[in-house]
């Protein structure tokens, strides 16, 4: 009884099972009751990559340099030629029949995966903490500069397209130091005023004073380490000394007691 189905690597023809031709060979004649399937090897520029009953081998793919293609792997009687693209180009499709230039990632985007001969550049948006300020087919998103590690402070925040701008710490320190210095000055001034008040109210135990001309009291004379001859410097900006202005006495005139 003739078979209705055949084993693997066989095919049914004229009510009998014939062997398929192995990869790299084409069918010349089907098997008969007396002979096996006749197969012949594919020629130099041809191939067949499966067990088959093809009467013609397939032509190897041509990697056309005019389309930016070059041979990645030479074809055999069992495999097709594999084409790839020249440097800087990638295949337009899976079959790689022509090539196109790699895409560049715009500013704000970095390269997630560098393009190959068969795949385009894959870009990704730069996440927070990273930036890209160039249009490139190779550069990844770069991390923002760390101002702290350079003993600097952030003067301008970074974006996905720009790096942070770092600056010296002065301004920031000044914001803390100035109020502290002013506070200290204020306390000193207060103490001085209290001291002056006390000195001014001190009674004279010896003889009653005759009426005197108003006199200047140098309240700095009693302060330890003070030089009455030296002008007092104001300390204002960031505790930096400010030079005494010319034509101004550094003494405070005190009104004569009544």
């Amino acid at each position: 009884e003739p078979p209705t189905a055949c084993r693997e690597k066989q095919y049914l023809i004229n009510s009998q099972c014939c062997s398929l031709c192995q990869p790299g060979q084409k069918l010349v004649s089907d098997c008969t009751e007396f002979t096996e399937t006749e197969c012949l090897p594919c020629s130099e520029s041809e191939f067949l990559d499966t067990w088959n009953r093809e009467t013609r081998c397939h032509q190897h793919k041509y990697c056309d340099p005019n389309l930016g293609l070059r041979v990645q792997q030479k074809g055999t009687s069992e495999t097709d030629t594999i084409c790839t693209c020249e440097e800087g180009l990638h295949c337009m499709s899976e079959s790689c029949e022509s090539c196109v230039p790699h895409r560049s990632c715009l500013p704000g985007f970095g390269v997630k995966q560098i393009a190959t001969g068969v795949s385009d550049t894959i870009c990704e948006p730069c996440p927070v903490g990273f930036f890209s300020n160039v249009s490139s087919a190779f550069e990844k998103c770069r991390p923002w500069t760390s101002c702290e590690t350079k003993d600097l402070v952030v003067q301008q925040a970074g974006t996905n397209k720009t790096d942070v701008v770092c600056g010296p710490q002065d301004r920031q320190r000044a914001l803390v130091v100035i109020p502290i210095c002013l506070g200290i000055l204020f306390v000193i001034l207060l103490l001085v005023l209290v001291f002056i008040k006390k000195v001014a109210k001190k009674p004279n135990d010896k003889a009653p004073h005759p009426k005197q001309e108003p006199q200047e009291i140098n309240f700095l004379d009693d302060l330890p380490g003070s030089n009455p001859a030296a002008p007092v410097q104001e300390t204002l900006h960031g505790c930096q000394p400010v030079t005494q202005e010319d034509g101004k006495e550094s003494r405070i005139s005190v009104q004569e007691r009544q």
């Epitope: 010349v28 004649s29 008969t32 009751e33 002979t35």
Partner: antibody
Framework: QVQLEQSGDDLVKPGASVKLSCKAS????????INWIKQRPGQGLEWIGR????????HYNEMFKGKATLTVDTSSSTAYIQLSSLSSEDSAVYFC?????WGQGTTLTVSS | DIVLTQSPLSLPVSLGDQASISCRSS???????????LEWYLQKPGQSPKLLIY???NRFSGVPDRFSGSGSGTDFTLKISRVEAEDLGVYYC?????????FGAGTKLELK
């Protein structure tokens, strides 16, 4: 119906060459191998060789290499056997066959 | 080369008898695809051989069912259940599995 029509009987001189033909009809010529068989008077059957009309591939019995050359002409569906340097040993009936069908045979006589 | 040994070389029978012819090969004639190309032919005097059995046991079209083939590997048998007058002649076994293809020496079926 399948038929294999062989050329007529031949008488040739020793040392000469001869080309016998076998014209196929009633089937696709390229589908079946053509075998050539030799039978000397009162003897058994000897396989000379075979040819695939589809590819031109040939297989020979070592004993007949250099003696027999098998060819085909697919345009006329005809197979040929050329026998060279003939001697009386080559006197025999030559059959062409595709196994299930046989030609009627050609009697070759080599004699001076 | 594969040698096919037939026995007996001569088989005298009476019409209506059962006849059995053996064919032994010097090595297995199962080919790489698992096929056994063993055939049986009958040649009557002055005629071309005719195919009876192919692939060990398959009867060729038009062959009476009194002919049957069996065997495997290296041992094969042709049986004729009831011999008729038209069955007389020389029977050849033939192997087409391995080149060079070979015939047995033949068994002559004749009347007692």
């Amino acid at each position: 119906q399948v038929q294999l029509e062989q050329s007529g009987d031949d008488l040739v001189k020793p040392g000469a060459s001869v080309k016998l033909s076998c014209k196929a009809s009633g089937y696709t010529f390229t589908t079946y191998w053509i075998n050539w068989i030799k039978q000397r008077p009162g003897q058994g059957l000897e396989w000379i060789g075979r040819i695939s009309p589809g590819s031109g591939s040939t297989h020979y019995n070592e004993m007949f290499k250099g003696k027999a050359t098998l060819t085909v002409d697919t345009s006329s569906s005809t197979a040929y056997i050329q026998l060279s340097s003939l001697s009386s040993e080559d006197s025999a009936v030559y059959f062409c066959t595709r196994n299930d069908y046989w030609g009627q045979g050609t009697t070759l006589t080599v004699s001076s | 080369d594969i040698v096919l040994t037939q026995s007996p070389l001569s088989l005298p029978v009476s019409l209506g008898d059962q006849a059995s012819i053996s064919c032994r090969s010097s090595q297995s004639i199962v080919n790489s695809n698992g096929n056994t190309y063993l055939e049986w032919y009958l040649q009557k005097p002055g005629q071309s051989p005719k195919l009876l059995i192919y692939k060990v046991s398959n009867r060729f079209s038009g062959v009476p069912d009194r002919f049957s083939g069996s065997g495997s590997g290296t041992d094969f048998t042709l049986k004729i259940s009831r011999v008729e007058a038209e069955d007389l002649g020389v029977y050849y076994c033939f192997q087409g599995s391995h080149v060079p293809l070979t015939f047995g020496a033949g068994t002559k079926l004749e009347l007692k």
